[in-house]
């Protein structure tokens, strides 16, 4: 199947991806076309835009040329200037600022906690199955199978540290070689990037916001996929990661030291352990073929236990099973021996919600999955709302300048590397790349950070998570120290190699272009985002897993033709865009294929048909929520929530007016402006920090 043309161009003409739109009017209250060169992308930035989405009110303005949808929007400052405020207004403004900061930190805290609970939920739902993936003996001989197992397990348990720790314990127990573990680690790296992609889906309401957020999140995915695409064959051929890490491990005489510091967990753990606590050892035990673990619950019941070593008389089937001949006897009926038995005495139960419910793991997992996704979504909406109200005018300018501006010439190239270090440092502090990249996603969405700047931050995050793993390895007990350190180093050098491949030379920054391409498609066809998620993180790995189980001949038999078609399509696409004259007229575009094979339009029609019946109730629900939100925020009565979004979209699209999907992330002031209701906000409602 040929690729859809939208994939080819990361920065296409918006007429390509704006349904029914040929031009667009940027929302600029002062009607100026002033540009702002604070951005390292060196593209014009209009003072204010919500591209390519619109307020539901038609803005009568002269048609102008469409701006680049990847430009950062200038968040309009609708507040009174500080100098124009009276003393009471200033005090109120300060308190309002402090209140917003507290709220922001609060929602950020619950956002991180919900990510932790989400990981626990995934482990409860798919942890045991994930553990069983590891017990497949073919991993040793098939690196591709190892890779997809790494992806699937990490996706199922929503934690690369869990899958990595399983691999470490398996290597330490000689159930797995370091060579066989490397592809699993690569897969775990891919799997961990799903979290921020899920977070990006929460911003689906606003097309332009979603475009940026989704591209910002998937830049991580593409970096990992492309790194694996190049480095896995290199590793299989040369075993460079294994060799380099072995040399490092053998050249140092490590002593296992202190535990790796738990920085963010110190704050989040007291809350998350009231929700649920898991016995992570169960998944590892299943991975190691421990039959008894299959019937154990992952939900931890006893938090305080006393383990006592005692000598006990135990029966054995024959003398051969005796501890030693002198420690064996018969009572005439059975043969007995004396063994050291660890007797575990339960002292105190855990203090989480599910401790006394005795629900099956799947039920607890589903409950937590729903709750954590709702909390995650709610927190994200509130974070975006608060940031939207705080990051206006001069504040936004200062922040955007700080984050997105390069160092002066000739040190501009250093900016990205500093961003990598910042990303690594921040990830080390929060002890999770998922948390860091997920926190980054809404900031990209609302336009605080460009994708070009988010990319090195994400790469740094990948490095940060491996330094955490190295520290954890150094703190591990003697029997697992070598293997855990070697695997952590493999992870580290894999990410370093990936950065060297896809960052230093701007031309090689393919993940940015690919992510922008995907962002454009997903903004136009929002269902494609979920489709992408399912295909890349579930279907492809599961298919490869299935084919690998069938054996090499089947895998090669199916894989080679598929890879050949993909290469053929890519080459054709490259020739179509670079030198179409080389190709015969028929191959200069994809029109020779049926429409469904080179465009998403027919697919969109099919999906719309299926999702149609669900849009009305969903819309009504959205309207109710929106009304509540409007009441809380003090929106006018004529807030667009009062009319069902579906009717609005259909009606306005019929008139050729592009519509902005009803979304709770909107700037209230813009809505008022659009409805001709702009009034000077009194000091009670609106406030600007500078």
């Amino acid at each position: 199947m040929a690729p859809w043309p939208e994939l080819g161009d990361a920065q296409p003409n918006p007429s390509k991806y704006l349904e029914g739109a040929t031009s667009q009017q940027p929302i600029t209250p002062d009607k100026s076309k002033e540009t702002n060169k604070t951005d390292n992308t060196e593209v014009p930035v209009t003072k204010f835009e919500l591209l390519p989405t619109y307020s539901t009110a038609t803005l009568i303005e002269e048609p102008t040329e469409v701006d680049d949808p990847w430009n950062l929007p200038t968040l309009q400052d609708s507040g009174i200037k500080w100098s124009e405020r009276d003393a009471k207004g200033k005090i109120l403004c300060v308190f309002q600022g402090i209140g917003r900061l507290i709220l922001l930190l609060g929602f950020l805290y619950f956002f991180v906690c919900s990510l932790d609970v989400l990981s626990s939920a995934f482990q409860l739902v798919g942890g045991k199955m994930a553990g069983q993936f590891f017990s497949n003996s073919s991993i040793m001989s098939n690196p591709l199978l190892g890779l997809v197992i790494g992806v699937l397990v990490t996706v199922f348990v929503q934690s690369s540290s869990t899958s990595t720790s399983i691999v470490v314990s398996m290597v330490a127990s000689s159930l797995l070689t370091v060579r066989a573990a490397i592809p699993i680690i690569m897969g775990a790296n891919i799997g961990t990037s799903i979290t921020n992609t899920i977070v990006a889906l929460m911003q689906v309401g606003d097309r332009s916001e979603f475009r940026r957020a989704f591209a910002g999140a998937t830049v991580h995915d593409f970096f990992n996929w492309l790194s694996v695409l190049v480095l896995l064959p290199v590793e299989v051929a040369t075993h460079y990661l294994e060799v380099v890490t072995q040399l490092i491990v053998e050249s140092f005489h490590f002593k296992n030291g202190e535990d790796a510091p738990d920085l963010l967990k110190v704050i989040t753990k007291p809350f998350t352990k009231l929700i649920v606590q898991l016995d992570k050892k169960v998944i590892s035990q299943i991975a190691m073929n421990d039959e008894t673990a299959k019937n154990k619950s992952l939900v931890k019941i006893w938090c305080k236990t006393f383990t006592n070593m005692t000598q006990m008389n135990v029966t054995v089937p024959s003398m051969a099973n005796c501890t030693s001949p002198s420690l064996c006897w018969t009572d005439g009926i059975q043969i007995w021996t004396m063994k050291n038995v660890t007797y575990k005495e339960n002292i105190a139960k855990c203090q989480h919600i599910f401790v006394n419910f005795h629900l099956p793991d799947l039920a607890v997992g589903i409950i937590l999955l729903i709750i954590s996704l709702l909390v995650l979504c709610g927190c994200l909406i509130m974070i975006v709302k608060i940031l939207g109200s705080v990051l206006k005018g001069q504040v936004a300018t200062v922040i955007k300048k700080t984050i997105n501006t390069d160092f002066p010439f000739p040190f501009a190239w250093l900016t990205g590397y500093l961003a990598i270090l910042v990303g690594a440092g921040m990830t080390f502090i929060v002890q999770s790349s998922s948390v860091f990249t997920s926190a980054l996603t809404p900031l990209i969405g609302i336009g605080v950070i460009t994708i070009e700047r988010a990319y090195p931050l994400t790469l740094g995050s990948n490095i940060g998570t491996t330094t955490t793993a190295i520290l954890a390895a150094l703190a591990s007990p003697g029997n697992t120290l070598r293997s855990s350190l070697q695997i952590a180093l493999c992870h580290f050098f894999f990410n370093i190699s990936g950065i060297l491949l896809w960052y230093p030379i701007p031309f090689t920054r393919l993940p940015i272009r690919m992510a922008k391409g995907l962002g454009n498609i997903s903004a136009k066809y929002r269902w494609f985002a979920i489709f992408y998620l399912i295909i890349f993180f579930f279907l492809i790995p599961l298919t490869v897993f299935g084919l690998s189980l069938a054996g090499w001949p089947v895998l090669v038999g199916v894989g080679v033709p598929v890879v050949f078609i993909i290469i053929l399509v890519l080459c054709l696409r490259l020739l179509q865009s670079r030198c179409p004259r080389v190709l015969p007229k028929k191959l200069q575009n994809w029109n020779f294929l049926p429409l469904c094979m080179h465009s998403l339009k027919p697919w969109d029609a099919v999906i719309s048909k299926f999702t149609g019946p669900f849009q009305m109730p969903c819309c009504c629900c959205c309207r109710v929520c929106c009304r509540v939100c409007c009441l809380l925020c003090g929106c006018p009565k004529c807030c667009r929530c009062s009319k069902c979004c579906q009717d609005l979209e259909e009606g306005q699209e019929a008139q050729g007016v592009p519509v902005k999907a009803p979304e709770t992330f909107d700037n209230i002031t813009i809505s008022r402006e659009a409805q001709g209701e702009v009034r000077a906000p009194d000091s009670k409602t609106e406030c600007t920090a500078l």
Epitope: N313, T315, M319, P325, S326, L327, C328, W329, T330, D331, G332, I333, Q334, I335, W336
Partner: antibody, heavy 121, light 107 residues
Framework: QVQLQQPGAEVVKPGASVKMSCKAS????????IHWVKQAPGQGLEWIGA????????SYSQRFKGKAKLTADKSSSTAYMQLNSLTSEDSVVYYC??????????????WGQGTLVTVSA | DIVLTQSPVTLSVTPGDRVSLSCRAS??????LYWYQQKSHESPRLLIK???QSMSGIPSRFSGSGSGTDFTLSISRVETEDFGMYFC?????????FGAGTKLELK
């Protein structure tokens, strides 16, 4: 005091079966293993098997599997040994002896007086 | 099965003599060895448990020693009531086995 009472003699026909008893007293019958030992006149001792009255577990020496069957009646604190297909070679003394608790090494602190089985036509 | 070999088969002594009866195991049995005395027309009586521990009510002239494969029952001063058969028994390995016995007789 601990006592194990056995009938002094049993006379049986060749090919027939005999069920001899061993009545225990002076201790908790279900807590200790009862062993059966064979002794030919002027010969050594040979272990036949054992039964744990607490749960009815039994164990037999390879030589006596199918030949001997051990049972216990908790209500009367009596252990039984049934010998099948008797021949003249089975005309020996059979002792019951109290072993130790379940799981403790087997040694016999208390013995019955023994039952002399005579196989004759 | 573990084979216990007792020697001598017969031991002729006079009262007041010191005697040693030997029991050798075909493989190591730790200290799971017991000594029994059986007088004519009587049931066996346990003398020594765990190779060296005397049972209560047993005269102090009886003592046991050894571990592994070689065991000895010693009678410091033989008295007339001590004559009879002496058997050793092991419970280290299933099944329980007895030695063929040593006959202690009056010289």
């Amino acid at each position: 005091q601990v006592q194990l009472q056995q009938p002094g003699a049993e006379v049986v026909k060749p090919g027939a079966s005999v069920k001899m008893s061993c009545k225990a007293s002076g201790y908790t019958f279900t807590s200790y293993i009862i062993h059966w030992v064979k002794q030919a006149p002027g010969q050594g001792l040979e272990w036949i098997g054992a039964i744990y009255p607490g749960n009815g577990d039994t164990s037999y020496s390879q030589r006596f599997k199918g030949k001997a069957k051990l049972t216990a009646d908790k209500s009367s604190s009596t252990a039984y040994m049934q010998l099948n297909s008797l021949t003249s070679e089975d005309s020996v003394v059979y002792y019951c002896a109290r072993g130790n608790n379940y799981g403790s090494p087997a040694w016999f602190g208390y013995w019955g007086q023994g039952t002399l089985v005579t196989v004759s036509a | 099965d573990i084979v216990l070999t007792q020697s001598p088969v017969t031991l002729s002594v006079t009262p007041g003599d010191r005697v040693s009866l030997s029991c050798r195991a075909s493989q190591s049995i730790g200290n799971f060895l017991y000594w029994y005395q059986q007088k004519s027309h009587e049931s066996p009586r346990l003398l020594i448990k765990y190779a060296s521990q005397s049972m209560s009510g047993i005269p102090s002239r009886f003592s046991g020693s050894g571990s592994g494969t070689d065991f000895t029952l010693s009678i410091s001063r033989v008295e007339t009531e001590d004559f009879g058969m002496y058997f050793c028994q092991q419970s280290n390995s299933w099944p329980v086995t007895f030695g063929a016995g040593t006959k202690l007789e009056l010289k």
